[in-house]
Interface confidence: medium
């Protein structure tokens, strides 16, 4: 019986010769469990595994811990890939994280972290980041050192106010911190002075809710 080719991430997919952007089936490290992910094969040389996308407000991001763990939405549209998969993947080897942002005025910016990984669920999928470059602010809008992940039903932030409940969405909240790319989606002309929107403080300030965001990862040695 012919052995089926499995892909760990979109870099594997790209290296196999499949260089068209789209949805591919990826396999968890050291497991047969599978997940579907959107592979961006064009941005900066391709091979990017998309772990989050916001673009139109079609998906509710005010989800439970379990939903953020396993992922939700459609990889071709708005979605969260899943903390468990991302944690397992990013603990296998060194990954970079690229966050691409778009505002309502047509401007685009990005933040690139040269080293990214998530702790295991035991440690609440705490985010670890090093080496920020890019155009979306000189200071990291994801608080450093990294925080545990919080959702509406699992509060691990550093605020008495319970950030996930107030800001909506699951995120690595501090108290509550300068970002939340999983906040409420606000349409154009309703996107300012919004405390609970899609926020990246060191690019657009505190009250501005973004039009579109993509978070994607790729092995550092790609």
């Amino acid at each position: 019986k012919e052995e089926q080719i499995t892909f760990r991430d979109c870099a594997d997919v790209f290296r196999s010769g499949l260089t068209t952007s789209g949805i591919y089936t990826l396999t968890f490290p050291n497991s047969t469990e599978e997940t579907k992910a959107y592979c961006d094969m064009e941005t900066g040389g391709g091979g990017w595994t998309t772990i989050q996308r916001r673009e139109d407000g079609s998906v509710d991001f005010q989800r439970t811990w379990k939903e953020y763990k396993v992922g939700f939405g459609n990889p071709s549209g708005e979605h969260w890939l899943g903390n468990e998969f991302v944690s397992q993947l990013t603990n296998q080897q060194r990954y970079v994280l690229k966050i691409h942002l778009r505002d309502w005025e047509g401007n685009e910016a990005y933040s690139l972290y040269e080293h990214f990984y998530l702790s295991s669920e035991e440690f609440n999928y705490r985010i670890h980041l090093k080496g920020l470059t890019g155009t979306a602010g000189k200071i990291s809008s994801i608080s450093q050192p990294g925080n545990d992940f919080s959702t509406k039903d699992a509060d691990n932030d550093k605020c008495i106010c319970k950030c996930s409940q107030m800001l909506t969405g699951g995120w690595w909240f501090d108290a509550c911190g300068p970002s939340n790319l999983n906040g409420m989606y606000y349409p154009q002309r309703q996107n300012t002075n919004k405390f609970n929107g899609i926020k990246w403080y060191y690019w657009k300030g505190s009250g501005y809710s973004l039009k579109a965001t993509t978070m994607m990862i790729r092995p550092a040695d790609f």
């Epitope: 811990w65 509406k152 039903d153 699992a154 509060d155 691990n156 605020c159 008495i160 106010c161 319970k162 409940q165 107030m166 405390f195």
Partner: antibody
């Protein structure tokens, strides 16, 4: 519709005990930290205690004035939060309100606790 | 503990007046401040949180401002139903503390 209904208040002698209950409905109780706030007759508001979630190991915080005497707890299966009050003092006389996570959007109607000999 | 000092403790005003209540924190609380309205025999109602965000259903005549240690609640045009006692609260650190209250009475 969100509802918080307190019960268990009443007249008690100094040194006595009471257990207040707060039954919650209309929201996902298990997702909210819960608090007790009290108001002495003709006075302002005073925060008393807070209990967090299962994911926080039901961590608690107390005002210094009640620490060691009052215990906050919750029963998720009954959507109820409790305040066990022991060694009551006359200065504990107040209306006790059950509320949600700070800042407090949901309030009960309050239950009056009178500590008097 | 963080003290929240509210002033004035009471004020008299007429319908249509602009009313300003201030609250001073004894140390920096960022914007972790809420304002409540309470009428006699009733539970308090949340008006403003995070210093300036109006709670759902609160009329636009109520506004909050400030950060750090100095906070203000403004009622732009006082209505008959606004005569009540107002409290500020900090939720930046434990113990959570309230101001002493400001009673707004009819002149």
């Amino acid at each position: 519709e969100v509802q918080l209904v307190e019960s268990g208040g009443g007249l008690v002698k100094p040194g006595g005990s009471l257990r207040l209950s707060c039954a919650a409905s209309g929201f996902t109780f298990s997702n909210y930290w819960m608090n007790w706030v009290r108001q002495a007759p003709g006075k302002g508001l005073e925060w008393v205690a807070e209990i967090r979630l299962k994911s926080n190991n039901y961590a608690t915080h107390y005002a210094e004035s009640v620490k060691g005497r009052f215990t906050i707890s919750r029963d998720v299966s009954k959507n109820t939060v409790y305040l066990q009050m022991n060694s009551l003092k006359t200065e504990d006389t107040a209306v006790y309100y059950c509320t949600d996570t700070a800042p407090f959007a949901y309030w009960g109607q309050g239950t009056l606790v009178t500590v008097s000999s | 503990d963080i003290q929240m000092t509210q002033s004035p403790s009471s004020l008299s005003a007429s319908v249509g007046d602009r009313v300003t209540i201030t609250c001073k924190a004894s140390q920096d609380v960022g914007t972790d401040v809420a304002w409540y309205q309470q009428k006699p025999g009733k539970a308090p109602k949340l008006l403003i949180y995070w210093a300036s965000t109006r709670h759902t259903g609160v009329p636009s005549r109520f506004s909050g401002s400030g950060s750090g240690t100095d906070f203000t609640l403004t009622i732009s045009s006082l209505q008959p139903e606004d005569f009540a006692t107002y409290y500020c609260q900090q939720y930046s650190s434990y113990p959570l503390t309230f101001g002493g209250g400001t009673k707004v009475e009819i002149k």
